[in-house]
Amino acid sequence: FNISGCSTKKLLWTYSTRSEEEFVLFCDLPEPQKSHFCHRNRLSPKQVPEHLPFMGSNDLSDVQWYQQPSNGDPLEDIRKSYPHIIQDKCTLHFLTPGVNNSGSYICRPKMIKSPYDVACCVKMILEVKPQTNASCEYSASHKQDLLLGSTGSISCPSLSCQSDAQSPAVTWYKNGKLLSVERSNRIVVDEVYDYHQGTYVCDYTQSDTVSSWTVRAVVQVRTIVGDTKLKPDILDPVEDTLEVELGKPLTISCKARFGFERVFNPVIKWYIKDSDLEWEVSVPEAKSIKSTLKDEIIERNIILEKVTQRDLRRKFVCFVQNSIGNTTQSVQLKEKRG
């Protein structure tokens, strides 16, 4: 189709080489058709489309995204050619940063219902650059945490080095929905609820003498509980003796509950004590068996191919540790009688 009639928007993605970050493009089709099949209110009231209204019907359910190759080849369907780009309704998600994402992206409704609809499309010219060293080194992260039940804030990474006074007007989105009242480089969350978790996008306009473009950053916001004040506790084994059959294989499980920590480095290991000697056993990797907002239960097994007489003289010790402290639970094997 002819893309010369598409409205055009220029976007800049400056990514940090130090962190993983994502990016999104919204299919900002002119009103009123967008509300039939995209999130409503993506455009702010001041962004009035300059082109013909789209006469789409209510059964539109999706849009089609294309990339325009720089060599003039025909448009390529995003879904077929770019595995690191995911389409979700009217939003295009870039999972990995890189200058190779630069280019022109076009979106339009999948179903064309009237002659006007042919021109109902948006062309987004995306420029992707790595952040230069001259940029602010203490810029806000693209992954930000909010502590449940307390006051918090979400900062726009591309503007976090500027004071509120000198910051340009910012347009914020949460999970693709325009937050029309939020206009500064920082959103204050009076009281954090689970509701505040999600993908936030901040946009602001930058201009030079020739043109203007939208600078965009994406922030993944996670709601968390406060760091635990407790050392981990061992849920299993509970008993300090275990009846076993000699010559049979044996698996002893150690399950421990670790409270939430923002910087989480749990330790769970088995070691063996035999008279004055003790050594760590190489056992299968630990695995998380239950994870909630407040804590995580991790399990690690010790496997004996067959229980020997010597094992009955040893103590098998599960050792667990977090930043607060450690806990141990030892198990003595006892031969089953009769």
Epitope: H39, R40, N41, G149, S150, T151, I154, W172, K174, K177, L178, L179, S180, V181, E182, I187, V188, V189, D190, E191, Y193, Y195, H196
Partner: antibody, heavy 121, light 111 residues
Framework: QEQLVESGGGLVQPEGSLTLTCTAS?????????MCWVRQAPGKGLEWIAC????????TYYASWAKGRLTISKISSTTVTLQMTSLTAADTATYFC?????????????WGPGTLVTVSS | DVVMTQTPSSVSAAVGGTVTINCRAS??????LAWYQQKPGQPPKLLIY???TLASGVPSRFKGSGSGTDFTLTISDLECADAATYYC?????????????FGGGTEVVVK
């Protein structure tokens, strides 16, 4: 028993100023609460004016028409005020103090009986 | 600011009947909407919050529904005591749960 009482209403000259006070009893302002002012002109509907968050951020929120001329403040753990300047006849109304907040905005709902402000010469 | 538009401005129904009041937000407010009842000379009384959650002590004859931009309050088995003015209110401001804009009100007359 939790209660809100508004005071400070009365007759005021056009272009004059007035400060309304909302006093809480039976509870004190804390996190999760927004203390708000709402007004109702005689025979008309409810009109939101402003809210202040009672927790640490102290964030204030205003209806666009109220910005600059009306100021909401938390004076103590039981008192919120609304300062009004450049009053006109259009500001004649019963002014209500209300408590809202929590996940959903109104779980802690409580209203005062209102105080009447009349702007007239 | 979000603009809340309430329809109709007045509605009448017989005792035992049903009335439906609509409220439309100028932008997506998810489910952050409250409904109030106000009688002359009294402050408003909360009926429903989060679009459909009944406030304590409110009879189940009052039912709220909707999300996004379109919301409805339905009062069934009307009683004389239900004669009042009903208002919707948006309770989301950006990312914060701030009670803010009201609809224009709907007067319910019970015959």
């Amino acid at each position: 028993q939790e209660q809100l009482v508004e005071s400070g209403g009365g007759l005021v000259q056009p272009e004059g100023s007035l400060t309304l006070t909302c006093t809480a009893s039976g509870f004190s302002f804390s996190s999760s609460y927004y203390m708000c002012w709402v007004r109702q002109a005689p025979g008309k509907g409810l009109e939101w004016i402003a809210c202040i968050y009672a927790g640490s951020s102290g964030s204030t929120y205003y209806a666009s028409w109220a910005k600059g001329r009306l100021t909401i403040s938390k004076i103590s753990s039981t008192t919120v005020t609304l300062q009004m300047t450049s009053l006109t006849a259009a500001d004649t109304a019963t002014y209500f103090c209300a408590r809202g907040g929590g996940s959903g905005g109104v779980d802690n709902n409580l209203w005062g009986p209102g105080t009447l402000v009349t702007v007239s010469s | 600011d979000v603009v809340m538009t309430q329809t109709p401005s007045s509605v009448s129904a017989a005792v035992g009947g049903t009335v439906t009041i609509n409220c439309r937000a100028s932008e997506d407010i998810e489910r952050f909407l409250a409904w109030y009842q106000q009688k002359p000379g009294q402050p408003p009384k909360l009926l429903i919050y989060k679009a459909s959650t009944l406030a304590s002590g409110v009879p189940s004859r009052f039912k709220g529904s909707g999300s996004g931009t379109d919301f409805t309050l339905t009062i069934s088995d009307l009683e004389c005591a239900d004669a009042a003015t009903y208002y919707c209110q948006c309770t989301l401001y950006g990312v914060n749960f701030v009670p803010n804009a009201f609809g224009g009100g709907t007067e319910v007359v019970v015959k």
